[in-house]
Amino acid sequence: SIPWNLERITPPRYRADEYQPPDGGSLVEVYLLDTSIQSDHREIEGRVMVTDFENVPEEDGTRFHRQASKCDSHGTHLAGVVSGRDAGVAKGASMRSLRVLNCQGKGTVSGTLIGLEFIRKSQLVQPVGPLVVLLPLAGGYSRVLNAACQRLARAGVVLVTAAGNFRDDACLYSPASAPEVITVGATNAQDQPVTLGTLGTNFGRCVDLFAPGEDIIGASSDCSTCFVSQSGTSQAAAHVAGIAAMMLSAEPELTLAELRQRLIHFSAKDVINEAWFPEDQRVLTPNLVAALPPSTHENLYFQ
Amino acid sequence: GAMGQEDEDGDYEELVLALRSEEDGLAEAPEHGTTATFHRCAKDPWRLPGTYVVVLKEETHLSQSERTARRLQAQAARRGYLTKILHVFHGLLPGFLVKMSGDLLELALKLPHVDYIEEDSSVFAQ
C-alpha cells in the first residue's frame, strides 16, 4: 500500500491503491547537494547523474572507517524521496548530485558555496528547463551562504532547504534563514512536528511550510534493492523539492514568487498541533503541510 | 525561507573593523569611510578558523578578484605569513577563499573591493 508520506501529499481525488504520477517532473532538473550517492540503486538508476563536483572536509577521528554504504546513505535516501520509482514524489524528475557532505554528513559553508557556483556555471553553459536545488543541510547563520542563495534564486533557480533538526528558530541557521529559499520543517503521520531524539524540527518565521519528515521510506544504500526509513527536515525538504518539480513541469514559466504562492495555497492548513512549538513561536510558524495541487488539468501533474 | 521579512542575524557575530590608513602601498585605496565587516559562526564548535571567504563588492570582475587575492598574498608575505588561495569565486558572488592566519584579518579587511569576510564554518546533513 501507499506509504503514509505519499498519501499525505496526494490530493484525495487522486488517491488510489498506488501513488503513480509516472512522469511527474519530467521537464525539471533537480540538483542535490549532499553526500555521495549510490546512483545505480534500483529505485533511482538512470535518474541521477553524479556530477564530478566534490568538495568535502576530511572525516573527523583517526579511526574513522570509510564504508561506502554509510557514505552514500543520506544522499541516496533523499534522491529516492525526490524521484524514486516506487517511493518517490516526482517520478519523472531527473537529478544531478554534487558531493558537499562527507561520510559523516559534514560539509563546509565554503564547499557549499563552490557547489552553488558550479550549478550557476552549469546553467550558463547549458541552459535547460526549470532548475530546483535541494539543500538538505544546515549550519549556523551565514551571511555569505544566504547571499549566494539569493543570487542563485534571482537567476531563476528554485532553492529548497531543510529548516534544521535543532528544535530551534530556523532564522538562526543557514541556508534556512535565506528569504529567497523555500525552507521546510518536518511533520509526522499525526501532523505533529517531528521530534528527533532530544531535538526536532526547527520552526519560526523563516520556515515557509512543513512536509512529511518522519519514518520516510526511501532507497537504502545498504544494497541495490534495499529500502530504509529515515527522518529529518532533509526528508521534508525532499518532498517539497519533488512537489516543486511537478509544479514546474506542469507550468515551466512559474516565477519563484508564484511557485511559493502555489505551494502555500495547496498546503493543508491548520492541521499541525502548535502546542509543540515554544509559545512565542506559534504565531510566527506557518501551519501548513505541503501537498500536490488537486489540478483541474489532471494531465498537468499526472502525465 | 519565508520572504517578505527582514533578515535577522540572530546571535550571529559581526566584527566591524574600521579601516585605518596603514603604509601598505595599496594602489586602489578603499572609498573613504567605508568599513568591511568580519563575520563568524555564532556556534563555536562549528567554526573553522584559518579559512576565510573574502566577499568583494557586487560589481567586482574576476580579474579584480584575482588581483585582490594576489595583493593579499603579497602583503601577507611581507609580514612573514604564508597564505593559500583555495578558490576564486565568480558567477554568483565575487571573492575568494583563502587559508590564512586570523592575524591577517585586519589587513584583508582593508583591501580594495572587499565587502565583508566570513570565517568558514561547518554545515551538516539534516
Epitope: D40, V48, S224 | -
Partner: antibody
Amino acid sequence: EVQLVQSGAEVKKPGASVKVSCKASGYTLTSYGISWVRQAPGQGLEWMGWVSFYNGNTNYAQKLQGRGTMTTDPSTSTAYMELRSLRSDDTAVYYCARGYGMDVWGQGTTVTVSS
Amino acid sequence: ESALTQPASVSGSPGQSITISCTGTSSDVGGYNSVSWYQQHPGKAPKLMIYEVSNRPSGVSNRFSGSKSGNTASLTISGLQAEDEADYYCNSYTSTSMVFGGGTKLTVL
C-alpha cells in the same frame, strides 16, 4: 549510442567454468549496473543477477547462489559473468542488459555445455 | 520466486487489438510500479517495449500500451501488424530481485 557488446560463443564440458564479458559504452557507467539474463533453447527468460559498476556490489538470483560470480572492471567498462561447475542444463544464450530496467541488451553469448 | 503467469499464446488479425495479461502477486506486480514488457523476435535479443507499467521508450510505436490493476499487468497492441509477431515477456521487481513471465507467443493471422 548506448551499446552492450558481448564476447563470442563458448563450448564447454560439464564441470568446467565459463566467463562471459559485456563491454558497455555510450552512457554514464555508474548510473546503472548490469543485469545478466539467460535463455535456454526454446525456453523463456531467466534473470540471473545484477552487478554494480559503481561499487562492485552484486545481487544474485537464489538459483545462482554459489555457482556464479559477477564482477565489473570500470577501467575497461566491462562486466563479467562467470559460471562454474557447468551442467548440460546451463546450455543457453546469456545476455547482459543495462541496469535493473534492462532497457538495452547485449547481442547474447551462446554457451553450449556438452560432453 | 515463481515466474509471472502469462498466456502461452495469443493471436489476432492485422488491424485488430490484442491484450496479453501478466499475473503475479502483491509481492511483485502488485507491489511495485516497475512492470516492463519485452518483445523478442526469433534469434534476436529482447527489446524493451514498456517500462514502469505504462511508459514507452522513445522509438516504440504508440500502438503499444501498458496498464496494471492489482496484481495483473497488461500489454495491449492495437492496429496489429505482421511485424508484431514475436514472443512477449513481462517482468517485475520483487523485493530483492527480478522475475519474468513465462512468455506469450503472439501470432498475427
